[in-house]
């Protein structure tokens, strides 16, 4: 009896494994066994497939091969028992265009209200994606064991930390790699769940800000207690991006270890230009807080963002001020690349009630002053931009008199 | 694969000094932190220090500030540990080993006996 | 600094016995504790990292569980390489710092 070709033959490939599956075409006949032959782009001779010679299942694995992954080759499958089928070719393929990225590694680590998830490629030094490694991109799915409301989150890269969750509570996850350059979407990894701590007594520092004082970065935060010492670190933001990378070497500020106020005050020389994170973490001798929450510290937009230089002309019911470019050392204008919203604040001499008007124009009126009055104004920046959500600080108050009162034109 | 090795035993007397070396291979140290751990005889581990062999940064406990001096040599891929005015009771088994993030301490040196006696 | 504790400071088991060995913290450090094996005249070997990892090579008869300021190693099913002296250790905040070791012997 002539023996039938094997059929339906699927090629699957994930990472560096390189699985075939294919179906028997005659279940009726016993002890057959299943051989392949590949060709390369422009061969015209067949090789045999090794690892998936004379195989009694309907399965092989074919990962040993040392191909060019972007090179299309060609199978085909033949039946053998006493004598053989003919051959089902397998229409060619290339196999980094077929490969699906596998499911990624998990690390979690817990915090009190926090977990830290490292994630790195399934496969070490895979070949597949050997010219992709830099570009994985990760997604995930958090949820609550005990609600299962699930939370998305997208574009992370290989470190990500996850704040304001609750303590003594589990949360499970699973992630999946994307090479978006290559509109590749992986599998996802198994679910892993973690249980946050029990909560830390000294909670971390919130709210940390960066502004520019003359030739200083400021950095401020809040904390909940009195009579602290805290330390500040950075890292260069790009580090996080790379997949290879465990230990993140976090650099200490020197002018901000062991500080005992809320703020601390660096020269800015300290960080050439670029990108940081910044984090804040307080202690009170015994005990030591979690980290903050990472803030994001661009030096382009930071030493930008100046507190806006203004004149004043003096009316007897109001104020003109126009603002002009913040002045650096050398007395240069700083140039501004980014629309700015001006806020001014304004009050009586004599008196703390404040008012305010933000204006986008760099020309503003202050209306409804007192004749003969003096009356005292500062100015800050922001950026339009709600990404960068910036703000410099505010320019010294300066102090004026308002004109008798027949001088409003 | 993943080694660190330490050098050999010491004999010191009591106020000399001595600097001991923890050569790392299979790894590249400047990824790394290089911790060092002392133990006496029959005691547990207790932690001196460690260093950043990318840019020489280091920590110390407390008790052992200004008395250890950690350093490294990235060329070679070897860091060191320098213990000044030693006394008696610094006789004791000093290991190195490779810090990994997360992975902490993940590979040991094999230790080195550094005895103090007049 | 973080006092470590560890209980019990030594005990005896026979091939085969399932044994626990906990782990105190003085402050909450998260995750961030590890587990090493030590034999006489030997160098540590790192067993547990980030509370519940194993390292690879080691038997999964080993486990790490707890999270805050209790930690607990587990050894399923002792066998006779594993009579040693295990210590645990976290890396939290400087100054780094371990137990004092639990030293498991043969009944």
């Known amino acids: 009896k002539n023996l039938k070709s094997p059929q339906k033959v699927e090629v699957d490939i994930i990472d560096d494994n390189f699985i075939l599956r294919w179906n028997r075409s005659d279940e009726s006949v016993g002890n057959v066994t299943f051989s392949f032959d590949y060709q390369k782009t422009g061969m015209d001779n067949w090789i045999k497939l090794s690892g998936c010679q004379n195989i009694t299942s309907t399965k092989c694995n074919f990962s040993s091969l040392k191909l060019n992954v972007y090179e299309e080759i060609k199978l085909r499958i033949r039946a053998e028992k006493e004598n053989t089928s003919s051959w089902y070719e397998v229409d060619s393929f290339t196999p980094f265009r077929k490969a699906q990225i596998g499911p990624p590694e998990v690390h979690l680590e817990a915090e009190d209200k926090a977990i830290v998830i490292h994630i790195s490629p399934g496969t070490k030094d895979s070949v597949m994606w050997a010219l992709d490694g830099l570009s994985f991109t990760y997604s995930l799915v958090i949820w609550k064991n005990s609600s299962g409301v699930e939370e998305r989150i997208e574009n992370i890269y290989s470190r990500h930390k996850i704040y304001k969750l609750s303590p003594e509570t589990t949360y499970c996850l699973k992630v999946k790699a994307a090479l978006l350059t290559s509109w590749k979407i992986g599998v996802y990894s198994p679910v892993h769940c973690i249980k946050t701590t029990v909560e830390n007594e000294l909670p971390p520092p919130e709210n940390i800000e960066v502004s520019v004082q003359n030739q200083n970065y400021v950095l401020k935060w809040d904390y909940t207690y009195a009579n602290m010492t805290f330390q500040v670190q950075w890292l260069h933001a790009f580090l996080k991006r790379n997949p290879g990378n465990h230990l993140y070497k976090w650099k200490q500020i020197p002018d901000c270890e062991n500080v005992k106020t809320t703020q601390c005050v660096f020269p800015q020389n300290v960080f050439q230009k670029g990108i940081y994170l910044l984090r804040v973490q307080a202690s009170d001798g015994n005990n030591t807080s979690f980290w903050s929450e990472e803030i994001k510290f661009d030096t382009e937009i930071q030493a930008f963002l100046l507190p806006p230089v203004f004149n004043i002309r003096s009316l007897s019911d109001s104020f003109h001020i126009y603002i002009g470019a913040p002045k650096q050392s050398g007395n240069t204008p700083v140039i501004q690349d980014y629309p700015l919203i001006y806020e001014i604040i304004f009050w009586e001499n004599t008196s703390n009630a404040e008012r305010k008007i933000i204006e986008k124009k760099t020309d503003v009126t202050v209306p409804n002053l007192k004749p003969l009055t003096v009356y005292c104004v500062k100015a800050r920046a922001h950026t339009m931009d709600e990404k960068l959500n910036k703000s410099s600080v505010f320019s010294d108050a300066v102090c004026e008199k308002t004109k008798p009162g027949n001088t409003s034109k | 694969q993943v080694q660190l090795v330490q050098s050999g035993a010491e004999v010191k007397k009591p106020g000399a000094s001595v600097k001991l070396s923890c050569k790392g291979s299979?790894?590249?140290?400047?990824?790394?932190?290089i911790h060092w751990v002392k133990q006496a005889p029959g005691q547990g581990l207790e932690w001196i220090g460690r260093?950043?062999?990318?840019?020489?940064?280091?920590k110390y406990a407390p008790k052992f500030q200004g008395r250890a001096t950690i350093t490294a040599d990235t060329s070679i891929s070897t860091a060191y540990l320098e213990l000044s005015r030693l006394r008696s009771d610094d006789t004791v088994v000093y290991y190195c080993?490779?810090?990994?993030?997360?992975?902490?301490?993940?590979?040991w040196g094999q230790g080195t006996l550094v005895t103090v006696s007049s | 600094d973080i006092q470590m504790t560890q209980s019990p400071s030594s005990l005896s088991a026979s091939v085969g016995d399932r044994v626990t060995i906990t782990c105190k913290t003085s402050?909450?450090?998260?995750?961030?504790v590890a587990w090493f094996q030590q034999k006489p005249g030997k160098a540590p070997k790192s067993l547990i990292y980030?509370?519940?990892y194993r390292y690879s090579g080691v038997p999964s008869r080993f486990s790490g569980s707890g999270s805050g300021t209790d930690f607990t190693l587990t050894i399923s099913s002792l066998q006779p390489e594993d009579f040693a002296t295990y210590y645990c250790?976290?890396?939290?905040?400087?100054?780094?710092?371990f137990g004092p070791g639990t030293k498991v012997d043969i009944k």
């Open positions: 080993g490779r810090y990994h993030g997360y992975w902490a301490l993940d590979y």
């Open positions: 299979g790894f590249n140290i400047k990824d790394y932190y």
């Open positions: 260093i950043d062999p990318e840019d020489a940064e280091t």
């Open positions: 402050q909450n450090v998260g995750t961030n």
């Open positions: 980030s509370t519940s």
């Open positions: 250790h976290q890396y939290f905040s400087y100054p780094y710092t």
